[in-house]
């Protein structure tokens, strides 16, 4: 007997799709070897139609795929647009030739069934409404009208014109006539369920003069759409349930053992397992909505269903749409920290991966909010103004070509705790979710700036010092001036290598920044930070106020004001006359043309991308000593 297992018989109808799962023994060799699907010929030869090596036959072009799921020890063959020519004997198997391990599968594709001429076929989805049309002659205009359902030889009345309704059709079936029509009556059956399917007979009159019509009702269960997503990527379920449920509560549920467990609904219910990584967005007034889930996990794989009902819960006889989500563990999206911890007053540097093939894409960072159906207002972006409340403490540093950008948030408070999303206007799969946890600080911050009340006087020299601990000794220290389009690192150069020191004096590690002479436009936020290459670390921020020298006020000697800096043997100073053209930039409204859940933070449109790139020092000059 073959160790490969799968469906022995698969039957479908023309135009449909099939998804055939083949199971193989869980060994390393099996997980990595070639998987194939071939058609058995009369001569005993099995012709490959598709394989995991990338081969795809001409007859399967554009309509088939083979996907390996090594973590489940399965592979799936999807074939769409079936025709009767697809009927035949097949093998799914493993190995370098088609004679290896295999399982025989019989596929039968039938024509859409035909009925006698007098039978009208009605095809409806679960939860929908069917209107059965019943014609009669004038002689039966005043006779009793009825609709019955065939059960073997018997025909059980569903509804009739004497107002009888079968209990199982109560509140679902109505019999009516339209306008002045004297030769047709109609029966509506709403909230269709699978057991409603079958042959119906409508009748006007009694005995041999009665007019009869046959109706075959087919109630289709939702054909799940197959979705294949990578681990850590995102998925969007687009749900279109029709206008008739436009005003009912919507939900997305995941089929479980006993029930379909609601993940999110429009009444505010949300599964804690999806906290911080789910958004439900109404698309229009016709009942369309979408659910976006980011940071896909292995356990997210499964059967999902969206639906509508006033309770916000799945109900039999209400329209649904279905998906089967597969999560591929062999992901192109790198593993990044899902939880980042910080302390009050401190800072965090969050690394956001993006598709390295799209280095020119616009990068964004948004804050997931739990209210209503979840939303994610953009806080910062490469072409978006920093949102109110984040000025001077939030910046995005793009690192073109590295496949990642860094978002730095400092002056942390406990209110900053929550979920944040990294996203771009490019590949929508590359959306990562980070949970930021901010705890109360129990010790002094690693970086401290003096003086803490920084007021510079126009025309004078102003120096601020940043004290850092020995653990940052080998790291690159920098000062940058914060603006709405990033934090622009102030230029510096080392005048000779610093003397290496075996011991490190905790009190003498200082990096200073000097403004000489101070200009009005020097006012603003400055950051002191540490980094190693492209990896950003701790930062601290200080606001430098600039004022006119008042007549009669003493001229403060900057050397005295920064006496501590003067004595520092390990001092690194930067002197800069900084000119900042604050390019006001705005999030392109086309970015989420169909994803309004991620809100635009900008309020000033600008056609061109901001010219200053975070981390660049273009247009600035200065010296260090």
């Amino acid at each position: 007997q073959s160790p490969i297992f799968g469906p022995q018989d698969v039957s479908s109808i023309e135009g449909n799709s099939v998804s055939i799962t083949c199971y193989y023994p869980d060994t390393s060799v099996n997980r990595h070897t070639r998987k194939y699907w071939c058609r058995q010929g009369a001569n005993g030869y099995c012709a490959t139609l598709i394989s995991s090596n990338g081969y795809l036959s001409k007859e399967y072009s554009g309509r088939a795929s083979l996907i390996n799921f090594p973590e489940n020890s399965t592979f799936v063959i999807n074939i769409a647009h079936l025709t009767q020519e697809d009927t035949g004997s097949y093998k799914c198997g493993l190995g370098t030739t088609n004679r290896g391990l295999f399982f025989d599968v019989s596929l039968e594709v039938s024509q859409v069934p035909e009925f006698p001429n007098d039978t009208h076929v009605y095809t409806k989805d679960i939860g929908r409404t069917v209107t059965i049309e019943c014609r009669f002659k004038e002689g039966n205009a005043h006779s009793k009208k009825s609709l019955c359902k065939k059960r073997g030889e018997a025909c059980e009345v569903v509804i009739d014109s004497t107002e009888y309704v079968d209990p199982s059709y109560k509140d679902r079936a109505i019999l009516f006539m339209k306008g002045t029509s004297r030769d047709i009556f109609y029966v509506n059956i709403s909230h269709l369920i699978p057991s409603d399917a079958g042959l119906y007979v409508c009748q006007a009159g009694e005995g041999p003069s009665a007019d009869k019509n046959n109706a075959d009702l087919q109630v289709l269960e939702p054909e799940p759409e197959l979705l294949y997503k990578d681990l850590r990527s995102s998925v969007t379920f687009e749900c279109d349930l029709g206008r008739e449920v436009a005003n009912d509560a919507k939900y997305l549920c995941r089929k479980n053992k006993e029930t379909c467990d609601v993940i999110i609904n429009t009444l505010g219910k949300r599964d804690p397992a999806f906290e911080g990584r789910i958004l439900l967005t109404p698309r229009d007034d016709n009942g369309r909505f979408s659910v976006l889930i980011t940071g896909l996990r292995k356990e997210d794989a499964g059967h999902y269903q969206c639906g509508a009902h006033s309770s916000g819960l799945p109900q039999e006889g209400w329209p649904v749409q279905a998906w089967q989500l597969f999560v591929n563990e062999e992901s192109t999206i790198p593993n990044s920290r899902s939880v980042v911890k910080g302390v009050t007053g401190g800072s965090v540097a969050i690394v956001c991966p993006y598709n390295p093939k799209e280095s020119s894409s616009l990068k964004y960072w948004c804050h997931w909010e739990a209210d209503e159906n979840g939303r994610c207002p953009v806080l910062v972006g490469t072409q978006a103004l920093v949102q109110e409340g984040y000025e001077g403490r939030l910046a995005l540093f793009d690192q073109p070509g590295s496949g990642a950008y860094t978002v730095i948030l400092n002056q942390l408070t406990t209110q900053d705790s929550g979920f944040y999303w990294c996203l771009t206007d490019g590949d929508s799969r590359w959306r990562t979710t980070i949970e930021l946890q901010v705890a109360e600080a129990t010790k002094k911050p690693d970086l401290e700036v003096t003086p803490q009340n920084a007021t510079a006087v126009i025309g004078e020299t102003f120096t601020i010092s940043c004290h850092y601990p020995c653990k940052f000794y080998s790291q690159e220290k920098y000062w940058c001036k914060w603006s709405n389009d990033g934090c622009h690192i102030l230029p510096s150069h080392d005048e000779g290598a610093r003397q290496s020191s075996v011991s490190c004096d905790q009190s003498s590690q200082i990096v200073s920044m000097t403004l000489n002479p101070v200009k009005k436009e020097d006012e603003g936020w400055y950051w002191c930070g540490v980094k190693e290459g492209q990896v950003y670390g701790e930062t601290t921020a200080i606001y430098v106020a600039v004022e006119e020298r008042t007549r009669g006020s003493p001229h403060i000697n900057p050397t005295d004001a920064n006496a501590r800096a003067k004595d520092a043997p390990e001092e690194e100073a930067m002197e800069s006359s900084v000119r900042e053209d604050e390019n006001k930039a705005n999030l392109d409204p086309r970015l989420f043309a169909d994803e309004r859940e991620i809100q635009n933070a900008g309020d000033q449109a600008q056609e061109n991308r901001a010219s200053g790139n975070a981390g660049s020092a273009g247009g600035q000059s200065g010296s260090s000593k």
Epitope: Q8, D9, S11, S12, I193, E221, P222, H303
Partner: nanobody
Framework: QVQLVESGGGLVQAGDSLRLSCAAS????????MGWFRQGPGKEREFVAT??????????YYTDSVKGRFTISRDNAKNTVYLQMNSLKPEDTAVYYC?????????????????WGQGTQVTVSS
């Protein structure tokens, strides 16, 4: 909840046929697959056959020992699944259980089935 009721079991001679039925009621709209398992005297419960569906597409799975002899089918309108058993052998003697699943990753695994019937006895004498 889904309720399952089996019928059609009995005592037959080797080589004879039997047709088992499993009628489902309750929240049947949630089901995705239905199958048959059996438990012979002193043995563990084992997979026999399962039918899963997706719209108008059916997938039928069988254990090796019944291939070509047993056929599983379903009547959607009646919410009923059948197991047609031909060329019965004494080793087919067992209690046959009907099972239904809302989510099925591997149809052979017992723990993937959410609902079970009470079972119907099939005895094949030689």
């Amino acid at each position: 909840q889904v309720q399952l009721v089996e019928s059609g079991g009995g005592l037959v001679q080797a080589g004879d046929s039997l047709r088992l039925s499993c009628a489902a009621s309750g929240r049947t709209f949630t089901t995705y697959g239905m199958g048959w398992f059996r438990q012979g005297p002193g043995k563990e419960r084992e997979f026999v056959a399962t039918i899963t569906w997706s719209g108008s597409t059916n997938y039928k799975y069988y254990t090796d020992s019944v291939k070509g002899r047993f056929t599983i089918s379903r009547d959607n309108a009646k919410n009923t699944v059948y197991l047609q058993m031909n060329s019965l052998k004494p080793e087919d003697t067992a209690v046959y259980y009907c099972a239904a699943s809302t989510v099925l990753t591997d149809p052979r695994r017992l723990n993937e089935y959410d609902y079970w019937g009470q079972g119907t006895q099939v005895t094949v004498s030689s």
